[in-house]
Amino acid sequence: KSSNEATNITPKHNMKAFLDELKAENIKKFLYNFTQIPHLAGTEQNFQLAKQIQSQWKEFGLDSVELAHYDVLLSYPNKTHPNYISIINEDGNEIFNTSLFEPPPPGYENVSDIVPPFSAFSPQGMPEGDLVYVNYARTEDFFKLERDMKINCSGKIVIARYGKVFRGNKVKNAQLAGAKGVILYSDPADYFAPGVKSYPDGWNLPGGGVQRGNILNLNGAGDPLTPGYPANEYAYRRGIAEAVGLPSIPVHPIGYYDAQKLLEKMGGSAPPDSSWRGSLKVPYNVGPGFTGNFSTQKVKMHIHSTNEVTRIYNVIGTLRGAVEPDRYVILGGHRDSWVFGGIDPQSGAAVVHEIVRSFGTLKKEGWRPRRTILFASWDAEEFGLLGSTEWAEENSRLLQERGVAYINADSSIEGNYTLRVDCTPLMYSLVHNLTKELKSPDEGFEGKSLYESWTKKSPSPEFSGMPRISKLGSGNDFEVFFQRLGIASGRARYTKNWETNKFSGYPLYHSVYETYELVEKFYDPMFKYHLTVAQVRGGMVFELANSIVLPFDCRDYAVVLRKYADKIYSISMKHPQEMKTYSVSFDSLFSAVKNFTEIASKFSERLQDFDKSNPIVLRMMNDQLMFLERAFIDPLGLPDRPFYRHVIYAPSSHNKYAGESFPGIYDALFDIESKVDPSKAWGEVKRQIYVAAFTVQAAAETLSEVA
């Protein structure tokens, strides 16, 4: 069978037909439909939406659509015993209490089952004590407090502002500092853009708005009770004391009206510098405790949430490939939301829905993709990427043998300024070529390509005339596919012009105000940015599933490997004396990168020349491309993080959202000057260089001629 027999039309025409079928008006309708009530993981409402999506994907024409369920650990507030924080006087009387729920947005006052703001997986507890303000609660913030300012957080309740890093890292840092509770709040400096009104009159966070979110440190484990294995009917579950990643101290989030009341009384040390000041009219004193007049007052937390094993449902749709049905291209995004999910996730789910509809339309006209496309609506992403991870654990043997690529589809927008792409280097050329073929939706770029507007607004820091493409971190459903299984992955969305605030999210993130109206009134009234994101995500899936030769360029991996090796070497060279003392050499790593570069170059030449009409050779070359990402997986995983197995990339140990390159070496070098046993510490650096060099060399050899 020739490779073109999958289609009744020429490949170019197929892509055009697919893209032309995508309609902004449909995305708008789907978004409205998905956001009228809350769809919290583990609730009946989210199960009903799963069944609706299953039914609609079947109608759209997919070959099969199944629900895959798992019983995982989730967390909910106690309905009759609300969580809150008090200021108490010396008699123990509560003189101020934080709010019990957000004021509902206009039109939603009578909606039931809006979960109040809470930190998912917080243990129960009622700690009371003095407050310490810890800025963003980053590793460097605690270094500043403990090492420079000599402030001890042990036995204190810390208050940290949201932003910069994943909230779970903040809680982990606070725990390690000895805190007995954590209060998280949204400071207007991070969640209120100047010159924009608060919701419902604009897209800024009102004072009563609060960011929900999980505070786990799962490190890729999935369900905390069944790490490594699916949470199915016959699963063996750990006891709660052995569960992975649960916080050990109570945590609760608040808005900036309530934060003002706590922070305005703070005494103790002044903030160390201006980077510790937000935008509230408070001194941002670090503490500990309240100032003179209020020094006898304390803060008390009242947390009564419960962890419960609950059933969740993924929707898995299949469009069988005509030529290589055993090769899977996956498009997945989550369905569960904290409340209405106007942006997160339903702006993404609506785009996936329209992509499925378009593929279904082509299929009904007699077309099939060359490779199988799997579509997924994941559950319980907000509770720790649980739905995607459990499904991947259940299907890991199939995925590691057959997985070509995973394209993530969470929120389509976090702004309306320009495109943002994070992906494996294997996909750089695919993304560049695709965006050159798509029209830019941006004002002032009429008639220009998406590539052009993206490059102008978000230029690459290294290569002129090219756009920035970032490393994959985590905090979303690609994690298990990329970091654990080594399946080439990518994500794309429209973003804001706010580089300094990269990991803080948009102002209304995870609040009750993330509604359909937020998107329709303020972010994308014409749904043109949603359409563009649909074209990028859908176009990537189309090419990955339909191109005869996989659209991966291994030479781009060679380029970044050299860049990452240079970067980690320069970090290490900040300690020249120790490198000399302990005979630390990066020669093996640079040699492996050089070999990879040469072998990748030769492979690319062969890729241009081979006989594409020979299905065996074609399959062999494609398999080498498909398995290249897999070759960067170390079966033993990273130290203390067994489910982060990719040697080139891992989520930063200090911020789950950010990607780190050569993470094993990076972590071994981090704060090495403070290690009590330098010989052991530098020994670990050497071991990590060895692992990295071996892995790069081994990956290179998978691209060599097979015999």
Partner: nanobody
Framework: EVQLLESGGGVVQPGRSLRLSCAAS????????MHWVRQAPGKGLEWVAV????????YYADSVKGRFTISRDNSKNTLYLQMNSLRPEDTAVYYC????????????????WGQGTTVTVSS
Amino acid sequence: EVQLLESGGGVVQPGRSLRLSCAASGFPFISYGMHWVRQAPGKGLEWVAVISYDGANRYYADSVKGRFTISRDNSKNTLYLQMNSLRPEDTAVYYCAKERIFGVLTPDDFEIWGQGTTVTVSS
């Protein structure tokens, strides 16, 4: 259109109790802090009590602290004032009022929309 309808006033003897109600309509009651204010004959407005939109916080004027309790039922769009140990100086027209700003709690920034209900404390 915002409407606040107070009821429950009347004539009572000192030391007795009374419960005032205020039925709200025309705005999202659940999203606004609510106040009771009063005006004694021939005097200016006096703030009595405030409750946050969610009921988490309640604050009282010193003159009524320990005797009056403000509460609300968001499912019924109704505000209450339980008045115990009434004194002659509590004689006044009682108004319920809403906060001007969504989700905020301030003792002095409110709007009166109702006609009030009269409380007379006399032996």
